[in-house]
Amino acid sequence: IWELKKDVYVVELDWYPDAPGEMVVLTCDTPEEDGITWTLDQSSEVLGSGKTLTIQVKEFGDAGQYTCHKGGEVLSHSLLLLHKKEDGIWSTDILKDQKEPKNKTFLRCEAKNYSGRFTCWWLTTISTDLTFSVKSSRGSSDPQGVTCGAATLSAERVRGDNKEYEYSVECQEDSACPAAEESLPIEVMVDAVHKLKYENYTSSFFIRDIIKPDPPKNLQLKPLKNSRQVEVSWEYPDTWSTPHSYFSLTFCVQVQGKSKREKKDRVFTDKTSATVICRKNASISVRAQDRYYSSSWSEWASVPCS
Amino acid sequence: RNLPVATPDPGMFPCLHHSQNLLRAVSNMLQKARQTLEFYPCTSEEIDHEDITKDKTSTVEACLPLELTKNESCLNSRETSFITNGSCLASRKTSFMMALCLSSIYEDLKMYQVEFKTMNAKLLMDPKRQIFLDQNMLAVIDELMQALNFNSETVPQKSSLEEPDFYKTKIKLCILLHAFRIRAVTIDRVMSYLNAS
């Protein structure tokens, strides 16, 4: 058993049929010595008396808010949560496996630049009685500070018969140099509590590996005389690290119709303009990627050909 | 347009070209190592990230773009240990900081070159003959060093009398390649910045 926060405790249980469970001793936070009784949740049934209560925790029925009283007055509370371990593996029932970039990916994180700010998100099908808390650091043995905000519900989607909820959190490394060469990864830890179930999820990464620039901005077209070719120009996104001659981007320019199966024109360039062939009912799209360290491409920025 | 439009300094341009070749060569070598040593811990997640130039050179600090010198977090360990003149820029343009930066890059390359050559000598003794360093990568390191044209003492190649542990050598190769790739990215950024300035 360990303390998650004040008056909230996590009991780690090996979860299998007829498991013996864990013996837990609760102590009432009071100078009083006698006349103390214990109850669980809203029940008035007295579970025991005395300053300490010893319980055998085997299942979710044994978890919950234990309260010690004296003469009708509440003295203190202890909330017990369960953390299940099945076949040596901690349960991951609360969050959905996003399976990208690999299986067992519950947390996904992205950074728009090298400033040390990043966003992580996760998915769940649970809509109520759900809380998250997020901690982060650079490295684990001698951790350096990363400050994370509160996790918020950022999107709701319908997937088949199920509703899916996306939560996200923004974090900022306390003293980040955009030009630094990372040797210790960022660690992100998410505590998830659903009713009386506790789970924790972690992710470890270098900012350089989660970079995904914003799409290029200000796409403009200039038709070339006596040709089917069009000059398309754009600018670096405002959120990208500066100076741009140091933090350079490379671009992919594509002309394509509505369907992915349609024919297309595609060209890669380090410049902020390119010449392509425009077709009726097609769009010109441009996306960006760090020129020197190939992490993710940005989303496309698009303008219609006509 | 956001990128500074500048006529490339003919003196700088060869270094930019060589640094691009360097990044390409080390990325290819790292990819080859990951594939060949698939049953060794050779991915970014599996290895310890060590920097053999730590406390010996100060490339990131010495080559910091002017725009980032206002960032306190970038100036923690700003050192000024190298004062030399390089040939990548016309000497009249070579400011003190730029000379410091380019000589720091040169020292990095020299250190990695020695490590790679020592390692290759060991790998050549491996009866499995599983992996060797790409001669192209070693040649590209040499070409960039020549383009930088700094004079410094020759670092003797480390020779080892004990029997090499090939497993450890291959893991060390992965560690070295990952670190060198990150440094090559920095070098490429620096050359691009200097070329545009």
């Epitope: 024919k263 024109d265 060209v267 890669f268 077709r279 | -």
Partner: antibody, heavy 118, light 107 residues
Framework: QVQLVQSGAEVKKPGSSVKVSCKAS????????LHWSRQAPGQGQEWMGW????????EYAPKFQGRVTITADESTSTAYMELSSLRSEDTAVYYC???????????WGQGTLVTVSS | DIVMTQSPLSLPVTPGEPASISCRAS??????LHWYQQKPGQAPRLLIA???QSISGVPSRFSGSGSGTDFTLTISSLQPEDFATYMC?????????FGQGTKVEIK
């Protein structure tokens, strides 16, 4: 299986014209760009131009502009390349090639040898 | 026009050995470079697109690298069927241009 089948070898006199055909099978003809290029003996490939069979748009290499005409007949899934004012240096194997991507070629025809000789 | 220069023009290789062919562009072409294989009397065959993207159905022993002006096609271990002419093609701008070809011969 996508295939491009070209017409047979031709011998032409200098100053005349040649028209080479390229019949496509497999896939929808108008879903692909169609290119023509040539390879003279002992030389590299030389790109001549492309056509979008969907709308008849064409683009030609400046070297061949005014001398080459690329057309397409959607009803027969056939593209044509006509080269006029032939000279001896036009002796080459002419290839048609296609792709959904405009700028490179994933399927080629078998080639048609055109010999220009007096 | 962008001029594509291949080297060497002829490359004698022992079967089972690796081979590397170089292609240089007269100006920077990013990764807009494609590789083809051509055997005598046959149509060219696409091997690599955009400098390093593998093509389905092409053996994994063929790989490409490079960007800017310098590109390399590598065959990790030459098989008897790999003896052919290899050519590069730039797609950075029109007119599309090809290298003159490198003939890989049995040593």
């Amino acid at each position: 299986q996508v295939q491009l089948v070209q017409s047979g070898a031709e011998v032409k006199k200098p100053g005349s014209s040649v028209k080479v055909s390229c019949k496509a099978s497999g896939g929808t003809f108008s879903d692909y760009y169609l290119h023509w290029s040539r390879q003279a003996p002992g030389q590299g490939q030389e790109w001549m131009g492309w056509i979008d069979p969907e709308n008849g748009d064409t683009e030609y290499a400046p070297k061949f502009q005014g001398r080459v005409t690329i057309t397409a007949d959607e009803s027969t899934s056939t593209a044509y390349m006509e080269l006029s004012s032939l000279r001896s240096e036009d002796t080459a194997v002419y290839y048609c090639a296609r792709n959904k991507e405009l700028r490179y070629f994933d399927v080629w025809g078998q080639g048609t040898l055109v010999t220009v000789s007096s | 026009d962008i001029v594509m220069t291949q080297s060497p023009l002829s490359l004698p290789v022992t079967p089972g050995e690796p081979a590397s062919i170089s292609c240089r562009a007269s100006q920077s072409i990013s990764i807009n470079l494609h590789w083809y294989q051509q055997k005598p009397g046959q149509a060219p065959r696409l091997l690599i697109a955009f400098a390093s993207q593998s093509i389905s159905g092409v053996p994994s022993r063929f790989s490409g690298s490079g960007s800017g002006t310098d590109f390399t096609l590598t065959i990790s271990s030459l098989q008897p069927e790999d003896f052919a002419t290899y050519m590069c093609q730039q797609s950075n701008s029109f007119p599309l241009t090809f290298g003159q070809g490198t003939k890989v011969e049995i040593k």
